[in-house]
């Protein structure tokens, strides 16, 4: 947010940049929260655009019984590991195929015990205000599905008739991490000392961090013909004077006709 200055007054302007604004030789370069020739005005909306997607990561352990552990499986670049990874990934893609939020699996470690597979199940959803609920539900379905498959796909007579077989008791969910996104908190932080007056409103499921000086929202302050200006004590209406009227009042809704005042008469609209 910059305002260019030309002429003799510029040097004076330079020393008068307010609110942390810096002079670049032509204009005041204003910090995010401010605008105007001297950075004297507080913006009425702050971009807190959410990420397009929110991710979750589930740390799981399953025990694969249809493969015997060999030392080569510790080496992630070995043919053995690569083949195991391919089969395991294909198997998990089948297991979680009904979950729209499912992205894939990432094997972190293979260890002895048949083959104990430490891995992450990766989930992702489009950002909406309900993303936490969506991902919570998805993690529950993941738990259900992996429990079901590790109970059903088991070795019979030392042979697996499925793509992979599992130890029913070897399935554990270690940890669930969801990317945190709190628009209200972000809005408060970015509004700094004006945080008490900025709020989050949603439009088309997208959050907007706005002060009452931003028009078009439910919290918007109607200053009528005046101008809404933010101060440390909150939003205020700066009322205007026209050729014919003075405006006053909390929302500049009281107009006084000048001619009537000069004629010692007051008239309110």
């Amino acid at each position: 947010r910059t305002t260019t200055c030309f002429g003799d007054g510029c040097q004076n302007t330079a020393s008068r940049c307010k609110n942390g604004g810096t002079w670049d030789g032509l204009k005041c370069q204003c910090p995010n929260l401010y605008y105007g020739e001297l950075c004297e005005e507080v913006v009425s909306s702050i971009d807190i655009g959410p990420p397009e997607t929110i991710s979750a990561q589930m740390e799981l352990t399953v025990t694969v019984t249809s493969v015997k552990f060999t030392e080569e499986l510790k080496n992630h670049s070995s043919q053995e590991f690569q083949e195991f990874k391919q089969t395991f990934t294909e198997q998990m893609n089948i297991v979680y195929s009904g979950i729209p939020e499912y992205v894939g699996v990432n094997i972190t470690k293979l260890r002895l015990g048949s083959v104990v597979v430490e891995h992450d199940v990766l989930l992702r959803t489009k950002y909406t205000p309900e993303y936490k609920t969506v991902l919570d539900n998805a993690t529950e379905v993941v738990k259900e599905k992996i429990t079901k498959v590790t109970t059903q796909q088991i070795m019979i007579n030392d042979i697996c008739s499925d793509m992979m077989c599992f130890n029913t008791t070897g399935t554990q969910v270690q940890n669930i991490t969801v990317t945190q996104y709190d628009p209200e908190e972000d809005c408060r932080k970015m509004a700094k000392e004006y945080g008490d007056y900025f709020v989050v409103e949603y439009r088309d499921q997208k959050p907007y961090c706005i002060s009452p000086c931003e028009p078009g929202f439910s919290v918007s302050k109607n200053c009528n013909l005046g101008k809404c200006q933010m101060s440390l004590s909150g939003p205020q209406c700066l009322c205007v004077t026209t050729e014919t009227h003075w405006y006053s009042g909390e929302t500049c809704n009281q107009g006084t006709q000048k001619s009537l005042v000069y004629g010692h008469h007051h008239h309110h609209h």
Partner: nanobody, 123 residues
Framework: EVQLVESGGGLVQPGGSLRLSCAAS????????MSWFRQAPGKEREGVAI???????GYADSVKGRFTISRDNAKNSLYLQMNSLRAEDTAVYYC?????????????????WGQGTMVTVSS
Amino acid sequence: EVQLVESGGGLVQPGGSLRLSCAASGFTFSRGSMSWFRQAPGKEREGVAIISSDGWTGYADSVKGRFTISRDNAKNSLYLQMNSLRAEDTAVYYCAASFLVLRALNPKAWHYWGQGTMVTVSS
């Protein structure tokens, strides 16, 4: 590159015998697992027998006691001795390989395949 070439298929009478061979190249044959699968016309591919590098062998119930799987690591070869053949054994027989020590007779668990050899059991 892994290459598997089957041979030994043919026409045999019910009750007869046949020995299938699979010549392997492009990998360390002595490691991992080898197996035989078969696919009858109009049916899904099914596991027949498996042998691992540790010597473990496993068989489908339908061939137990009649078929024997073996390997010769020096010759990079896999074999399937088929005795007491029945009409229902008629199928294309495939050799499959894995770098893993597998205990699975599901085709989805196997990554490397030969082209197959036809076995017809008929009088």
